[in-house]
């Protein structure tokens, strides 16, 4: 028996280890809290709806609630959707929450609330009120929060949610919150650090405010603090893609030299965009446990050359000094202080946006003996010259990031072709600098309405490449030619990213010769000329090759394209050649005894497989181990009859999505004895097979969403016992008969998607209505989006809630 009604328009899941019952009603267009929420619900999410009020009745009988997420039901107008503006703020009636004696977490962000709600239960440990209209914090409003541990009050007064008054915090407002661990007042136009703060704090977020000066005793009692974020006070406004007001005379955030003396447990200090010109070592006198220091977006280019403060950070693991360039200055090279050599625990060093012309080996000498260094990020520096062999000193590094520079083919600084001594205005690089939306985002930790937790931390490198090991990222540079000497001494590299360069040479199998250990090569967004079938053959250990978006030469007629280069890559597992507009090939077949995945999206198989031309029907046949083939977006309005005979024998997954297919030879699936997943979504199919089981005995997943299917054949799923996943959503299906959906097949399904169709809810639908009400098969969006288009009285009604009692009477009569 089901323990909640199918009419509940929410996803219900059990977290058995935590003993949680989770009801998620995110973005269900609700205007009231739905009925039928199980009484044992522990976690209730109602974010992104239009519920206008909360009253004691709202959570009546939901006594086990531990967490309520009621965010974004009336988002402040400047922050919210312009086509669905909320003009009446959320009303919270007295005692709405007071009966919820187990409630620990309450999220009320984005509801235009004017005050901290009263009548909250003493069990509450987390209260989140971000993006409301609360800009006065008074002691009396916090008296009920005796057990609160986490308090989010940010984004209540800033450029995207203006309050037009100065944000006020009563003295000692937070002092009686004796269990408070995390306090966020970010994005609030706060002008001073609130005093006195409870000594229990472990995290304090004061970033993006209008604090111009820290007072000597602001943090005096915070001896348990582990994270302090003061970023964006006295911001560096150059190139800021948001309204930005620096402090008077562009002065830095003033921090007394002993301001941090009490913070003996501090692990993370963020001073991003504070217009700092100096970093006094005295700040760190007592902070010897500091692990992460963010000093990006300041004016520290000179300080980086002295950096005496680094001698006082023995435990530092992450250091970010990015975008500290002096305006209008293009330095000849990078000057790193010898003090960097003292950072024995350092794992991640980021110095983007220092802006210099030539990277020389001795520039990095202070880093040579840092045994724990894993990531060196020198992206977005407009480096023109770099002898890559210098990185032989950095074999232990996992990532060397030189992306978004102007590195061009090897040559020393005397080669006028690749450098110029003129002082270049950094302003001319503005669009590229703006592209980088990690350092130039107003609030990189902001939460969206959809997710409660802050966004993931910044990872600049392609994760799938990084997992193979040592990575050199040269993407988005000006490389137009590669030769083996460029990679001398880099045999330790496992991953090389050359994406987004200007390489247009005909590779012959010699260019990457030193890279004996390379497993992953990203060559996407270049201008590959596949004249030689020996291209890439020197990469004996290459497992993944991405040559997507290399369409330049494929778009020109009469050019040789040797697609059979794959036969020389003996361990290649995955090949991506998407968006290449491939419409011709000199070699008729691709060959490989190792390749398992081929992505061939965005090409022109419609031309290669043109009616009457059988030459390329076996293009993929000799990819003997191929299991996954994606040939979506190939403009295939039909498939010639020989296509399936020419498919590799071990194929498991085949995607033909977004092709404009008008018909499909279902019977031909018999050729694919191992096929498990077939994706035919986003086509123009109007029919399904007479009997799927006659076409394939192996198919487990069939995706037919976004087609033009109007009806299902009488015996569509008869004997299709292996099927586990069927997606028929976003079609034009009007009726489903019992014979099309035999129960002995349906009961094996893990997932059936039927939403966004055009069901006719006449008496002919009685069986279907009965079945969706009784089946245990998961049907997503059943309560909200599996609806009737007619007849009149039932238009827009959910199939699940149909009352076809009169039809049943007719049947019994």
């Amino acid at each position: 028996a089901r323990w909640f009604p199918k009419t509940l328009p929410c996803d219900v899941t059990l977290d058995v280890p935590k003993n949680h019952v989770i009801v998620d009603c995110t973005d269900k267009h609700l205007t009231e809290i739905p009925g039928g929420i199980p009484t044992n619900t522990t976690n209730l999410t109602l974010t992104i709806n239009h519920i206008p009020d909360i009253s004691p009745a709202s959570f009546h009988r939901l006594d086990h609630l531990v967490e309520i997420d009621f965010r974004c039901n009336c988002v402040p107008i400047p922050l919210g959707s312009k086509n669905n503006m909320c003009i009446k703020r959320l009303q919270i009636k007295p005692r709405s929450f007071s009966g919820l004696t187990y409630l620990k977490s309450l999220y009320l962000d984005g509801n235009q609330l004017l005050e901290i709600p009263q009548g909250l239960p003493p069990s509450l440990q987390l209260l989140s009120l971000e993006a409301n209209n609360i800009f006065s914090i008074r002691k009396e409003n916090l008296t009920e929060l005796a057990n609160i541990e986490i308090l989010y009050l940010g984004q209540n007064c800033y450029y995207r949610n203006p309050c037009y008054v100065s944000y006020s915090i009563e003295k000692d407002a937070f002092l009686n919150l004796t269990k408070l661990k995390v306090l966020s007042l970010k994005d609030n136009n706060v002008t001073a650090v609130p005093t006195v703060l409870p000594s229990t704090l472990t995290e304090l977020y004061l970033y993006n405010n209008m604090i111009a000066k820290i007072q000597e005793d602001d943090f005096n009692n915070l001896n348990q603090l582990q994270i302090l974020d003061l970023s964006g006070n006295c911001p560096r406004c150059y190139n800021a893609p948001f309204p930005c007001a620096p402090c008077k005379n562009n002065s830095p955030l003033q921090i007394p030299v002993n301001a941090f003396d009490a913070l003996t447990e501090l692990k993370v200090l963020r001073l991003h965009s504070n217009s700092l010109q100096h970093v006094p070592p005295r700040w760190f006198k007592n902070i010897n446990k500091l692990q992460e220091l963010d000093l990006s977006q300041n004016f520290l280019a000179k300080e980086i050359g002295d950096a005496k403060f680094l001698h006082f950070l023995p435990s530092l693991i992450q250091l970010d000094l990015s975008f500290n360039f002096e305006l209008q200055v293009y330095r000849a090279s990078m000057n790193l202080s010898q003090a960097f050599s003292s950072l024995k625990s350092l794992k991640i060093l980021r110095i983007r946006g220092y802006v210099f012309k030539e990277l020389k080996s001795f520039n990095l000498s202070p880093l040579h003996n840092l045994q724990n260094l894993e990531v060196l990020d020198l992206g977005t520096n407009f480096i023109k010259i770099a002898n890559l062999s210098m990185f032989k000193q950095f074999k232990r590094l996992k990532v060397i990031d030189l992306s978004v520079n102007k590195i061009s083919p090897s040559g020393d600084s005397s080669e006028v072709g690749f450098c110029s001594n003129a002082r270049t205005s950094v302003e001319s690089y503005e669009p590229q600098v703006l592209e980088q939306l990690h350092y130039f985002r107003y609030d990189k930790y902001a939460r969206s309405c959809r997710f409660k937790n802050k966004e993931a931390s910044f990872m600049s490198v392609n994760e799938s490449c990084y997992k193979y090991g040592q990575t050199l990222d040269l993407s988005k540079n000006s490389i137009f030619f590669v030769k083996s000497s460029d990679f001398q001494h880099l045999s330790f590299l496992k991953c090389l990213n050359l994406s987004g360069n200007l390489i247009s040479q005909t590779l012959n199998g010699s260019e990457f010769q030193p890279l004996a250990e390379l497993r992953y090569l990203d060559f996407s967004n270049n201008r590959l000329d596949l004249l030689h079938s020996t291209a890439f053959e020197e990469l004996h250990k290459l497992e993944v090759l991405d040559i997507s978006s290399n369409s330049h030469y494929f778009q020109s007629e009469g050019i040789t394209h040797m697609l059979n280069f794959t036969k020389n890559l003996k361990v290649l597992q995955k090949l991506m050649m998407n968006d290449n507009d491939i419409s011709s090939s000199t070699s008729r077949t691709m060959e490989s005894e190792s390749l398992r995945t081929l992505e061939f999206r965005g090409n022109h198989l419609d031309v290669l497989w043109r009616e009457g031309d059988n030459r390329y029907l076996q293009l993929f046949k000799n990819l003997l181990k191929l299991e996954e083939l994606d040939i979506s977006k190939n403009s295939l309005s039909f498939l010639p009859s020989g296509v399936f005979d020419g498919m590799p024998p071990n194929l498991k997954n085949l995607s033909l999505a977004k092709n404009g297919l008008k018909s499909f030879s279902w019977k031909k699936l018999q050729c694919l004895k191992n096929l498990e997943t077939l994706d035919l979504s986003h086509n123009q199919l109007t029919t399904v097979p007479e009997r799927l089981s006659n076409c394939s005995r192996s198919l487990k997943n069939l995706i037919l969403k976004n087609n033009q299917i109007r009806s299902l054949t009488k015996y569509f799923l008869q004997d299709a016992f292996q099927l586990r996943y069927l997606d028929l959503s976003s079609n034009k299906i009007q009726m489903i008969q019992k014979t099309s959906f035999p129960e002995n097949v349906l009961n094996n399904l893990k997932m059936l998607l039927l939403h966004h169709n055009r069901f006719l809810c006449t008496c002919d639908a009685v069986w279907f209505v009965w079945w969706v009400n009784h089946t245990e098969v998961t049907i997503p969006y059943l309560a909200t989006d599996v609806t009737c288009v007619g007849p009149g009285a039932h238009k827009g009604q959910s199939v699940i809630s149909l009352d076809l009692y009169t039809c049943e009477l007719d049947l019994t009569n």
Epitope: E216, Q254, P256, V257, N258, A259, H278, P280, P281, R282, W283, K285, K308, H311, F312, A339, S342
Partner: antibody
Framework: QVQLKESGPGLVAPSQSLSITCTVS????????VNWVRQPPGKGLEWLGM???????DYNSALKSRLSIRKDNSKSQVFLKMNSLQTDDTARYYC???????????????WGQGTSVTVSS | DIQMTQSPASLSASVGETVTITCRAS??????LAWYQQKQGKSPQLLVY???TLAEGVPSRFSGSGSGTQFSLKINSLQPEDFGSYYC?????????FGGGTKLEIK
């Protein structure tokens, strides 16, 4: 040119307090730290404490409970106060300027001529 | 606190000779070391900071060297005005501490 000049009482009775003033010229107290150092007769130098340009203070931990350093930027004066003097506090007391930016640990590049303090009843 | 140990405690030398005074720190102080000269009845004067940088106006016969825990001050071709006491001091964080001093006398 940079100058520092100490002025003190000369003689202090045991258990009494010592107050010394350091008057500076040629630089601003908001931009530099000022140290206090003493030297007992015939002995070496001992650092007592300092006041930074922003007014923050640091003290020798052995003397912290008895010491207080403050300043008046407008008068270009730095004040040392030391409580509960004993005979072993007899020494020449110097003020000296810290060489560099506020909050940076530098050497002392300019010294006063010192003022002699004798603790005796 | 960091201890600074100076040696020798006293030293006799003649004009024109070269002498070396050493200073050892109880822990790594990188190059945060200063040397001072103090003549009888006068206040100390800065000679060297950051272990090897000569202060303004200091003759080139003085030179500082070392890093980490071992440091030295070398005086080439001693002049009559070089006799007096010499002190090392670390400036690697608070509290600053001085060495016990080296008294350089005329032989």
């Amino acid at each position: 040119q940079v100058q520092l000049k100490e002025s003190g009482p000369g003689l202090v009775a045991p258990s009494q307090s010592l107050s010394i003033t350091c008057t500076v010229s040629g630089f601003s107290l908001t931009g530099y730290g000022v140290n206090w150092v003493r030297q007992p007769p015939g002995k070496g130098l001992e650092w007592l404490g300092m006041i930074w340009g922003d007014g923050s203070t640091d003290y020798n931990s052995a003397l912290k409970s008895r010491l207080s350093i403050r300043k008046d930027n407008s008068k270009s004066q730095v004040f040392l106060k030391m409580n509960s003097l004993q005979t072993d506090d007899t020494a020449r007391y110097y003020c000296a300027r810290d060489k560099g930016y506020d909050g940076y640990y530098y050497a002392m590049d300019y010294w006063g001529q010192g003022t002699s303090v004798t603790v005796s009843s | 606190d960091i201890q600074m140990t100076q040696s020798p405690a006293s030293l006799s030398a003649s004009v024109g000779e070269t002498v070396t005074i050493t200073c050892r720190a109880s822990e790594n102080i990188y190059s945060y070391l200063a040397w001072y000269q103090q003549k009888q009845g006068k206040s100390p004067q800065l000679l060297v900071y950051d272990a090897k940088t000569l202060a303004e106006g200091v003759p080139s016969r003085f030179s500082g060297s070392g890093s980490g825990t071992q440091f030295s001050l070398k005086i080439n071709s001693l002049q009559p005005e070089d006799f007096g006491s010499y002190y090392c001091q670390h400036h690697y964080g608070i509290p600053y501490t001085f060495g016990g001093g080296t008294k350089l006398e005329i032989k």
